[in-house]
């Protein structure tokens, strides 16, 4: 379905994506609702999801999911950041949204999620040093798995943003 | 400035147990991992494993994965390596080091322990 | 495992000259762009002292006369010129997969 089509009845609304990918929902009552992400995004439960492919700083990789009206990746479940690694590739890195900005250990998460030790995925022995102060999600062939890794923030990798799926 | 004090030499019986200890000083002890290493006289270094004292967590060389046990007190700013089931080839120094980044940046002045019956 | 095998077990060089240890690991201990690989060196009765770290980072109070260089499997350590003080055992070491290894030594005399 074209963005175009599906505004006939939202054109207030105003978005940055041109294309959406939409899959129609089932509602009760019987007007049609609609579920989207923008064009090659991905979709997982109530998220859409884009993996870049070029490397920036980890801040100028948050402003460009921003661009986007979407945040880097808050990991919230094991099975939303087993989604995201089935698309990721071994040999790069990506960053996701959280930080130490104090080198304190005292890690954030850019929406204000609370960071919960107990649900984390460090690699064994990360995060490694306070100087490091930005996550990425990377590969370890030992033992063989995606996992945490604090990096200095502003050396480039690649990185995915999160935003909700838009509902029309 | 950055100091691990480990304690003195040990001698010990085969089938033993010995504890050692590793104070640090000059940076926030729950910051960073405290990593374990041995060097058996005249030979090289091997790792043993590393323990994180601000939650405790663990991550052992498999080879030590049943000789050896960490722990850390942090109100002491100490952690501590249990070894279990001495034999001569435990006789060894143990160094402990703090990381700088990846690599072992910070070393204590090892702990010597002479397996000897 | 990743094997780090040094070369040569132990080399002399003369004063003021150059001296050139290897270290070439099993596979590649390059990740996101960084090289795990670092340089020790240990003198009788001590600790080892770290003198490069991530491949080619001078650590800090380590004079210049030591440097590091190389990417995934092939790492060289380079002191120019070697001074008395220098006579040692060099390791490397990777920090890229568990189990954290050690290459075997370099014995470094003066000639």
């Known amino acids: 379905q074209k963005y175009s089509q599906l505004l006939e009845k939202k054109t207030t609304k105003e978005l940055v994506h041109t294309t959406l990918e939409c899959v129609k929902k089932n509602m009760p009552v019987e007007e049609t609702a609609w579920s989207c992400c923008p064009k090659n995004w991905k979709s997982f439960s109530s998220n859409c999801y884009f993996i870049s492919t070029e490397s920036a700083s980890w801040q100028d990789s948050e402003k460009d999911c921003a661009r986007m009206e979407a945040h880097l990746l808050v990991i919230n479940t094991q099975e939303e950041q087993d989604f995201i690694f089935q698309n990721l590739q071994e040999e790069s890195a990506y960053f996701v949204g959280l930080s130490d900005p104090e080198g304190q250990r005292h890690w954030q998460w850019v929406d204000q999620t609370p960071y919960n030790e107990s649900s984390t995925f460090w690699h064994p022995r990360e995060p490694s040093d306070p100087n490091e102060r930005c996550v990425v999600l990377n590969f370890r062939k030992s033992p063989k798995r995606w996992g945490w890794n604090d990096v200095n923030c502003l050396g480039p990798q690649r990185s995915v943003c999160e935003m909700m799926k838009i509902h029309l | 400035e950055v100091q691990l004090q480990q304690s003195g030499t040990v001698l010990a019986r085969p089938g033993a147990s010995v504890n050692m200890s590793c104070k640090a000083a000059g940076y926030s002890f729950t910051s960073y991992w405290v990593y374990w290493v041995k060097q058996r006289p005249g030979q090289g270094l091997e790792w043993i494993g590393a323990i994180y004292p601000k939650n405790s967590r663990t991550s052992y060389n498999q080879k030590f994965q049943d000789k050896a046990t960490l722990t850390a007190v942090t109100s002491a700013s100490t952690a501590y390596m249990e070894l279990s089931s001495l034999t001569n080839e435990d006789s060894a120094v143990y160094y402990c080091?703090?990381?700088?980044?990846?690599?072992?940046?910070?070393w204590g002045q090892g702990t010597l322990v002479t397996v000897s019956a | 495992d990743i094997v780090l095998t040094q070369s040569p077990a132990s080399l002399a060089v003369s004063l003021g000259q150059r001296a050139t240890i290897s270290c070439r690991a099993s596979e590649s201990v390059d990740s996101y762009g960084i090289s795990f690989m670092h340089w020790y060196q240990q003198k009788p009765g001590q600790p080892p002292k770290l003198l490069i770290y991530r491949a080619s980072n001078q650590e800090s109070g380590i004079p210049a006369r030591f440097s590091g260089s190389g990417s995934r499997t092939d790492f060289t350590l380079t002191i120019n010129p070697v001074e008395a003080d220098d006579v040692a055992t060099y390791y490397c070491?990777?920090?890229?997969?568990?189990?954290?290894?050690f290459g075997a030594g370099t014995k470094l005399e003066i000639k």
């Open positions: 080091t703090r990381p700088h980044y990846d690599s072992f940046g910070y």
């Open positions: 070491q990777q920090s890229n997969e568990d189990p954290l290894t």
